[in-house]
């Protein structure tokens, strides 16, 4: 369960991959597409609004939470649109929705060094947002083998 329905804090950041590619969002045919691409030097990075929530339940990873609580986030690149996990299709999609947001829009935040993070699905522990074929996808992680695979690591920059 998530403690309270209001975020404890919010921040605006650009999202890039561990290998320094940018996550961008483009409106195409009245729906948003998500791309992973090399940005030209002068191009401005897309920003995402991260809303942080406290969750009472630890995730499947023995993570480093705050006082035993796990941090959860929602990610919104534009007003009224949120990143959501589609577990059936193993995809990450942008959907327009109203609050209260569905569970598919919540991700457990795992902090790593050098401002890197990973996002674990609230609805499917052990499944993370990752990069596959220049798109975001859901990737099942075998903790014993793959915890640090670069394709599930992202960098937050102000």
């Amino acid at each position: 369960s998530i403690t309270g329905i209001s975020p404890i804090t919010e921040s605006l950041a650009s999202l890039s991959t561990y290998n320094d590619q940018s996550i961008t969002f483009a409106l195409e045919d009245e729906s948003y597409e998500i791309y992973v691409e090399d940005l030209k030097k002068d191009k401005k990075k897309d920003k995402v609004l991260l809303s942080y929530y406290e969750s009472q339940h630890p995730s499947s990873e023995s993570g480093d939470g705050v006082d035993g609580k796990m941090l959860m986030v929602t990610l919104s690149p534009t007003k009224d649109f949120w990143l959501q996990a589609n577990n059936k299709e193993h995809s990450v999609e942008l959907h327009k929705c109203e609050k209260p947001l569905p569970d598919q829009a919540f991700f457990v935040l795992h902090n790593r060094s050098f401002n890197c993070v990973s996002f674990e699905c609230k609805t499917d522990p052990g499944v993370f947002i990752g990069v596959k074929d220049n798109h975001l996808a859901l990737i099942k992680v075998d903790y014993s083998e793959n915890l640090g695979s670069e394709n599930i690591l992202f960098k937050l920059s102000e």
Epitope: S16, D20, D64, S113, F114, G148, S149, L153
Partner: antibody, heavy 119, light 110 residues
Framework: EVQLLESGGGLVQPGGSLRLSCAAS????????MHWVRQAPGKGLEWVSS????????YYAGSVKGRFTISRDNSKNTLYLQMNSLRAEDTAVYYC????????????WGQGTLVTVSS | QSVLTQPPSASGTPGQRVTISCSGS???????AVWWYQQLPGTAPKLLI????MRRMGVPDRFSGSKSGTSASLAISGLRSEDEADYYC???????????FGGGTKLTVL
């Protein structure tokens, strides 16, 4: 075998410059954040600088900011540390280290190269 | 002065259990994973513990790490003469945007 090999250390006068290199082998160098950590004689470890896998982000300890520059050449599997305006307190063994993807910690270290700043 | 605080020395006899503490703050240990390194005389540091309590492959299970709040500790049970070394804790610090180390603890096996 996964290996890091530093070179370029030596004796330099205060105010002088030196460029350290670290040759990586046995792993996909371009996938990893790389780092420099130093250890003054008889003292503890001090993190110096880090660089992201494709050089978009560099980080520096306050004690070296503005004087040291970290860089990498992924085509040569080599990490560099350009050290300018050297001071006596920069005397140390300089280690290059890899940030392990799985461990999120410095999992592979070189053997170190000694930098002595003295007149 | 180091950002993370460790006792400068620790000692024990063979077979004993020894614990080394590492104290930090909410911006480093409180929010991030702790790493423990062993440095034998004249050699480069070697990673023992990552993610606060995960033993690196090949590290004997006599070594264990734990974390509570803004402090961490490394426990070595069944102490052996080859464990005599310097031990360092380290963590990422959110506010400094830097890796911070403890000052190191010299472990002597009596």
């Amino acid at each position: 075998e996964v290996q890091l090999l530093e070179s370029g250390g030596g004796l330099v006068q205060p105010g002088g410059s030196l460029r350290l290199s670290c040759a990586a082998s046995g792993f996909t160098f371009s996938n990893y954040y790389m780092h420099w950590v130093r250890q003054a004689p008889g003292k503890g470890l001090e993190w110096v600088s880090s660089i992201s896998s494709r050089s978009s982000h560099q980080y520096y300890a306050g004690s070296v900011k503005g004087r040291f520059t970290i860089s990498r050449d992924n085509s040569k599997n080599t990490l560099y540390l350009q050290m300018n305006s050297l001071r006596a307190e920069d005397t140390a063994v300089y280690y290059c280290a890899r940030l392990g993807l799985r461990h999120d910690a410095f999992d592979i270290w070189g053997q170190g190269t000694l930098v002595t700043v003295s007149s | 002065q180091s950002v993370l605080t460790q006792p400068p020395s620790a000692s024990g006899t063979p077979g004993q259990r020894v614990t080394i503490s590492c104290s930090g703050s909410s911006s480093n240990i409180g929010h991030n994973a702790v790493w423990w390194y062993q440095q034998l005389p004249g050699t480069a540091p070697k990673l023992l513990i990552y993610a606060s309590n995960m033993r690196r492959m090949g590290v004997p299970d006599r070594f264990s790490g734990s974390k509570s709040g803004t402090s961490a500790s490394l426990a070595i049970s069944g102490l052996r003469s080859e464990d005599e070394a310097d031990y360092y804790c380290a963590a990422w610090d959110d506010s400094q945007k830097a890796v911070v180390f403890g000052g190191g603890t010299k472990l002597t096996v009596l």
